[in-house]
C-alpha cells in the first residue's frame, strides 16, 4: 500500500509516457490519474516499468474499478495481467475473443497459470459453450487444454467445435474425457466417406464402444497399434481374433510387441488359444 502524498509541483502526469519510469512509487501514486491510466492502458506495455511500479499502477486501477475492470481496460492490460490474482479476474466480464487472445499472448510459452485458468473459465462460462473459435484459440496456446477439462465441462462442447480439434490436442485425455468427446466427433464427422471419416475419428476412438469398432473392422481401415492401444479395454475385450485382424490389417503383427501391455494383454487372455494361433504371432493366452 502506497501512502497518500501530494504530487510535487510540475510532476502531474498529462499522459502515460516514458518519463514515468523515473517516478518513485509514491510519485506514481500521487501524480498519475487513474482515469488517465485507464484510457491509455495500451501505452503501458511500451514502457519498461519495474515490477514495483506496475504494482502501483494496478493499485490505481483497483481503486478506480473496485467491482472489476471494464473490458476496454482488460484488453490492453498486457504485462500488467501477470500482476492479477485469480480473485481479481473473477470480477471481470470478458466477452471478446480478441481480449482473450491478447491476454493469452502475455503468458505465451509458459504453462497454464491459475490466472489464465480463471480467465478461460470466466470467458467460457460467459459464452455458455466452448465454440469453435474459442477452442481454436485455446488449443493454439495450450495444446493440452481440452484434456484439462472435466467430463462435465466437455459436455458443453458442441459437435461443430470438434472440427477445431487436432490429434495432439487429445494426447493427454483420459478414457472419461474421450467417452464424452467421441459421440460428439461421431456426430460431427458423420457425413464423411469411409477413409476420410477414419482419418478424422481416429484420435477420438479411445471413447468408442465395441459395436463401432466391429463396424470399423469391416471397412479395411488398417488401424495402427498406437490407436489400438488407446482403445477402451471394455470395448476391445469382446472383439474376436478375426475382427482384430481385420481392424489392424497389416499392423496386426504389432500385437506381439505389445502383448504385455493393456489393453492387448487383457484381450489376449480372453481369447481361445486356437484362435490366437491363427495369427501366427506366438501369442499365449
Amino acid at each position: 500500500e502506497v501512502e497518500k502524498t501530494a504530487c510535487p509541483s510540475g510532476k502531474k502526469a498529462r499522459e502515460i509516457d516514458e518519463s514515468l519510469i523515473f517516478y518513485k512509487k509514491w510519485e506514481l501514486e500521487a501524480c498519475v490519474d487513474a482515469a488517465l491510466l485507464a484510457t491509455q492502458m495500451d501505452r503501458v506495455n511500451a514502457i519498461p516499468f519495474t515490477y514495483e511500479q506496475l504494482d502501483v499502477l494496478k493499485h490505481k486501477l483497483d481503486e478506480l474499478y473496485p467491482q472489476g475492470y471494464p473490458e476496454s481496460v482488460i484488453q490492453h492490460l498486457g504485462y500488467l495481467f501477470l500482476k492479477m490474482s485469480p480473485e481479481d479476474i473473477r470480477k471481470w466480464n470478458v466477452t471478446s475473443l480478441e481480449t482473450l487472445k491478447a491476454l493469452l499472448e502475455v503468458n505465451k510459452g509458459h504453462e497454464m497459470s491459475p490466472q489464465v485458468a480463471t480467465l478461460i473459465d470466466r470467458f467460457v462460462k460467459g459464452r455458455g459453450q466452448l465454440d469453435k473459435d474459442t477452442l481454436d484459440t485455446l488449443t493454439a496456446f495450450y495444446p493440452g487444454y481440452l484434456c484439462s477439462l472435466s467430463p462435465e465441462e466437455l459436455s458443453s462442447v458442441p459437435p461443430s467445435s470438434i472440427w477445431a480439434v487436432r490429434p495432439q490436442d487429445l494426447d493427454t485425455c483420459d478414457p472419461r474425457q474421450l467417452d464424452v468427446l467421441y459421440p460428439k466427433a461421431r456426430l460431427a464427422f458423420q457425413n464423411m466417406n469411409g477413409s476420410e471419416y477414419f482419418v478424422k475419428i481416429q484420435s477420438f476412438l479411445g471413447g468408442a464402444p465395441t459395436e463401432d469398432l466391429k463396424a470399423l473392422s469391416q471397412q479395411n481401415v488398417s488401424m495402427d497399434l498406437a490407436t489400438f492401444m488407446k482403445l477402451r479395454t471394455d470395448a476391445v475385450l469382446p472383439l474376436t481374433v478375426a475382427e482384430v485382424q481385420k481392424l489392424l490389417g497389416p499392423h496386426v503383427e504389432g500385437l506381439k510387441a505389445e502383448e504385455r501391455h493393456r489393453p492387448v494383454r487383457d484381450w489376449i487372455l480372453r481369447q481361445r488359444q486356437d484362435d490366437l494361433d491363427t495369427l501366427g504371432l506366438g501369442l499365449q493366452g
Partner: antibody, heavy 119, light 107 residues
Framework: QVQLQESGPGLVKPSETLSLTCTVS??????????WSWIRQPPGKGLEWIGY???????NYNPSLKSRVTISVDTSKNQFSLKLSSVTAADTAVYYC???????????WGQGTMVTVSS | DIQMTQSPSSLSASVGDRVTITCRAS??????VNWYQQKPGKAPKLLIY???SLQSGVPSRFSGSGSGTDFTLTISSLQPEDFATYYC?????????FGGGTKVEIK
C-alpha cells in the same frame, strides 16, 4: 457381494514351500472380467505383487519371484492357490489375495494372513 | 519392470488441509495407474482407478490426475479418517508394481 478369504499355515520352515488358498464367496472365480492375484507385505514395508491367474488357468508372475511361484485355480471349489518354494526369512509377510477387475484395479481384498518363515 | 516412485514418503498435515501425493513411473504407464489407502492392520482399499476415476463409495474429496509418467492423488480437505498410508500402482505392464507408499500423519 464378492468376498475373499485366505487360509493356510501361519508358520513355514526355511527351504520349505509356503502354501495358501483363497476362497471366493458371493461370486464366481470364473468371472470374465476378473483375474485373481496374490500380493504380500513384509512387516513395516510396502506392497509387492506376486502374480495373478485367470479362470482359464493362464498365469502371470512377478519376474523376481517367477522361479519359485506357482498359482493355480480350482473352479469347482471357487478357489485359487499360491505355492512359494524354497522360502527364507525374507518371505515373512502378510499375504493378501485380491480380485483385479479389468476395468478398475484391485477392488476386493482378503483380510490378509500373516506367514512367518522360521525354524 | 516399470518402477513407481512415490513422494513424499511421509507428510504431516492437519484436518482441513489440501494434500497432494505424487507418483512417477520410470516409463509411460498411459493412464493405467490406481491409488490405494491402507490403515494399520487392514487390507488396502481402492480409491482411484485409471488415473482419475473415483471408485464407487469413495468420498469425492479424493481425486486423481495424470497420464504417461506423472500421476497425482489429491485429498481436497483432509478428514480425521484419512490419516493412513497411500500407494500408487501401475497395471499397464504385465508385471504390476506399487509405489513405496506415502504415510499421512497428523501434524
Amino acid at each position: 457381494q464378492v468376498q475373499l478369504q485366505e487360509s493356510g499355515p501361519g508358520l513355514v520352515k526355511p527351504s520349505e514351500t509356503l502354501s495358501l488358498t483363497c476362497t471366493v464367496s458371493g461370486g464366481s472365480v470364473s468371472s470374465y472380467y476378473s483375474t485373481w492375484s496374490w500380493i504380500r507385505q513384509p512387516p513395516g514395508k510396502g506392497l509387492e505383487w506376486i502374480g495373478y491367474i485367470y479362470y482359464s488357468g493362464s498365469t502371470n508372475y512377478n519376474p523376481s519371484l517367477k522361479s519359485r511361484v506357482t498359482i493355480s485355480v480350482d473352479t469347482s471349489k471357487n478357489q485359487f492357490s499360491l505355492k512359494l518354494s524354497s522360502v527364507t526369512a525374507a518371505d515373512t509377510a502378510v499375504y493378501y489375495c485380491a480380485r483385479d477387475f479389468v476395468l478398475s484395479g484391485f477392488d476386493i481384498w482378503g483380510q490378509g494372513t500373516m506367514v512367518t518363515v522360521s525354524s | 519392470d516399470i518402477q513407481m516412485t512415490q513422494s513424499p514418503s511421509s507428510l504431516s498435515a492437519s484436518v482441513g488441509d489440501r494434500v497432494t501425493i505424487t507418483c512417477r513411473a520410470s516409463q509411460s504407464s498411459r493412464y493405467y495407474v490406481n491409488w490405494y489407502q491402507q490403515k494399520p492392520g487392514k487390507a488396502p482399499k481402492l480409491l482411484i482407478y485409471a488415473a482419475s476415476s473415483l471408485q464407487s463409495g469413495v468420498p469425492s474429496r479424493f481425486s486423481g490426475s495424470g497420464s504417461g509418467t506423472d500421476f497425482t492423488l489429491t485429498i481436497s480437505s483432509l478428514q480425521p479418517e484419512d490419516f493412513a498410508t497411500y500407494y500408487c500402482q501401475q497395471s499397464y505392464d504385465a508385471s504390476y508394481t506399487f509405489g513405496g507408499g506415502t504415510k499421512v500423519e497428523i501434524k
